[in-house]
């Protein structure tokens, strides 16, 4: 479809409300430090221009590409050099290099304050100007999550609006809002991590890797859909995510709406679980489709061995049509295994490929590849046993101590990584236990390894910004499917020189007493990571004792009248006894 004016086309397709929201998100993801008011001004100017083009597509500049129009607009920001430094150099470039330049300057860890719910002030702002209030939410989330899936953020903004609509008239706004906003924050973090993994996959492994991931996942979700149907959805969905990852949020949202329409029109041949989704309005419909539960397996699925281990024509197909042949294997295997993680399915497909590569060069290929399915058994057993071991530990000690075990584990693997990053990753991995270990056996593995992939990608993204460990770089860049096994295989870094002991690292003050529980935990967990960096060979028992002593010390001093005096007096004693315990 060629349109005289791309901006008019998208404005007409999306409507003013969604158009404005997506432009605001896109701009906030590029210029993460700009004040909200500056972004609103830019968005209003772009929207007025889009309206002009919608009225007359041949008006001046309406034929320009969206990258040109948006890039030109971003480059008008007066404080660009002062606020962003070398990002301003992007403005010297021509498209498409300019947009690529903007993308490379997106900051996954911007130095922005934590957003604290303030029900009274927020309700007043919401009631005074709902559109501005929701715009501010889009802006605040987008600038903290520069790869957030644009159209999905519009959906979450509707949830946010619904929460305030319900809670602001309530007698106890705080009691009504806090649990809702906490739950929304968790969904936002999960959604952000999912899209970041897709964008990282494009950046580091290419479109083929994203397509393979999607073939596996969609075949699990839609086991009755035929290969052509899955191929069509994968192709369209890959385009959608490629656009969003490249900052082309208008095209992305438009194509996503088209895909949702297609899926709903053909739901009979895709999945029986789509009915409830397809009755909803656009944003809810797309979200619902993305999160839809796996359909029941068709009862008549034949065993795979006949076609993929016994057929004489396998090598002909492998040699002459490698990609599509392996694609059909991945589709057929995945649709039969909703109980496997995506990365496990990709590892199985990789093993199948390696076997054919070897066997098809031999004198008697069929005899060689006949036992290929036996080679999948150890691939499946390894993560299953890992999940069992970790869920057993989680059930024994609970979330907080499970997080601590993971912080210790990952600090030993990569002690060079910053403490805040190790604590964040350890805490996220620990929460996977709470999410997945309560599930039925058949759902534990996919839940655990799929969520682990998100947490490890976060580690890779943060490490890419400031690389400190060759072993982490290797795990992050070698293979998407092998990431988790690669990290699992990392042992204590023997080349690491233990960090010098600094008493101030372990010095606590009375301010810890007034912190919310999760921030208190983070303080203690930071100390734990620092202890491991100081004594990487400390035993579990030693660390448990020292951390227990720290917790008791904090509880004791926080219960005292003169808290600060207690911290000042007892702190050095604790530090000394801890050093002794770890000697």
């Amino acid at each position: 479809d060629t349109h005289k004016s791309e901006i008019a086309h998208r404005f007409n397709d999306l409507g003013e409300k969604h158009f404005k929201g997506l432009v605001l998100v896109a701009f906030s993801q590029y210029l993460q430090q700009c004040p909200f008011e500056d972004h609103v001004k830019l968005v209003n100017e772009v929207t007025e221009f889009a309206k002009k083009c919608a009225a007359d597509e041949s008006a001046e500049n309406c034929d320009k590409s969206l990258h040109t129009l948006f890039g030109d607009k971003l480059c008008t920001v007066a404080t660009l050099r002062a606020t962003y430094g070398e990002l301003a150099d992007c403005c010297e470039k021509q498209e498409p290099e300019r947009n690529e330049c903007f993308l490379t300057h997106k900051d996954d860890h911007p130095n922005l304050p934590k957003l604290k719910p303030e029900p009274d002030a927020q309700c007043a702002a919401f009631q005074e100007d709902p559109d501005k209030f929701l715009g501010k939410y889009l802006y605040e989330v987008a600038r903290r999550h520069p790869y957030f899936y644009g159209p999905e953020l519009l959906f979450h903004a509707e949830e946010y609006k619904a929460d305030f609509t319900e809670c602001c008239p309530a007698d106890d706004k705080l009691a009504c809002l806090i649990p809702k906003l906490d739950a929304l924050k968790e969904r936002i973090l999960l959604s952000s991590a999912k899209e970041r993994l897709k964008c990282s996959s494009f950046q580091n492994f290419g479109e083929r890797a994203v397509k393979a991931w999607s073939v596996a996942r969609l075949s699990q979700k839609f086991p009755k859909a035929d290969f052509a149907e899955v191929s069509k959805i994968v192709t369209d969905l890959t385009k959608v995510h490629k656009e969003c990852c490249h900052g082309d949020l208008l095209e992305c949202a438009d194509d996503r709406a088209d895909l949702a329409k297609y899926i709903c029109e053909h739901q009979d041949s895709i999945s029986g679980k789509l009915k409830a989704c397809c009755d909803k309005p656009l944003l809810q419909k797309s979200h619902c489709i993305a999160e839809v539960k796996e359909d029941d397996l068709p009862s008549d699925l034949p065993a795979l061995a006949a076609d993929f281990a016994e057929d004489k024509e396998i090598c002909k197909h492998y040699k002459d049509a490698k990609d599509v042949f392996l694609g059909t294997f991945l589709y057929e295997y995945s649709r039969r295994h909703p109980d496997y993680s995506v990365s496990l399915l990709l590892r199985i497909a990789k093993t199948y490929e390696a076997t054919l590569e070897k066997c098809c060069a031999e004198a008697d290929p069929p005899a060689c590849y006949r036992t290929v399915f036996d080679q999948f058994t150890p691939l499946v057993e390894e993560p299953k046993s890992l999940v069992k071991k970790n869920c057993d530990l989680f059930e024994e000690v609970g979330e907080y101590d499970f997080q601590n075990a993971l912080i210790v584990r990952y600090t030993k693997k990569a002690p060079q990584v910053s403490t805040p990053t190790l604590v964040e990753i350890g805490r996220t991995l620990g929460k996977v236990g709470s999410r997945c270990c309560k599930l039925p056996e058949s759902e534990r593995l996919p839940c655990s390894e799929n969520h682990l992939a998100l947490a490890l990608n976060r580690l890779c993204v943060l490490h890419e910004k400031t690389p400190v460990s060759e072993k982490i770089t290797k795990c992050c860049t070698d293979s998407l499917a092998e990431r988790r096994p690669c990290f699992s295989a990392l042992e204590l870094d023997e080349g690491y020189v233990p960090k010098e002991f600094k008493a101030e690292t372990f010095t606590f003050h009375a301010d810890i007493c007034t912190l919310p529980e999760d921030e208190k935990q983070i303080k203690k967990q930071s100390a734990l990571a620092e202890l491991v960096k100081h004594k990487p060979k400390a035993t579990k028992e030693q660390l448990k004792t020292v951390l227990g002593n720290f917790s008791a010390f904090v509880a004791k001093c926080c219960g005292r009248e003169d808290k600060e005096a207690c911290f000042a007096e007892e702190g050095p004693k604790l530090v000394a006894s801890s050093q002794l315990a770890l000697a």
């Epitope: 035929d226 290969f227 052509a228 149907e229 191929s231 069509k232 192709t235 053909h266 076609d307 057929d311 197909h317 002459d320 049509a321 990609d323 599509v324 042949f325 694609g327 059909t328």
Partner: nanobody
Amino acid sequence: QVQLQQSGGGLVQAGDSLRLSCAASGRAFNYYTMGWFRQAPGKEREFVAKIYWDGGSTIYADSVKGRFTISIDNAKNTVYLQMNSLKPEDTAVYYCAADPSFYPFRPKYWGQGTQVTVSS
């Protein structure tokens, strides 16, 4: 549902060329694998060639490799079989076929068939 309409075929001399066409209609055709089969008198229907929708992957029967070329035009929703260096043993009714799966290729949809006769 996919409908397949064949054209081409006829009587030619050994060594000549012929092109068969098969126009498809119906949804998601672009994601189907298209192929050609043939059935000689008194024999079973046999596989000739197939092509994946993106045009990048093709498989041929050993008996036609190097002489026949399968191609696809997604804009026209049409698949072609270019047959060169024809031999009398290529004489058969040729069927266009379509299936959602590239492998195993067990066609769900068939064209009406078209006669190709190669005289010596």
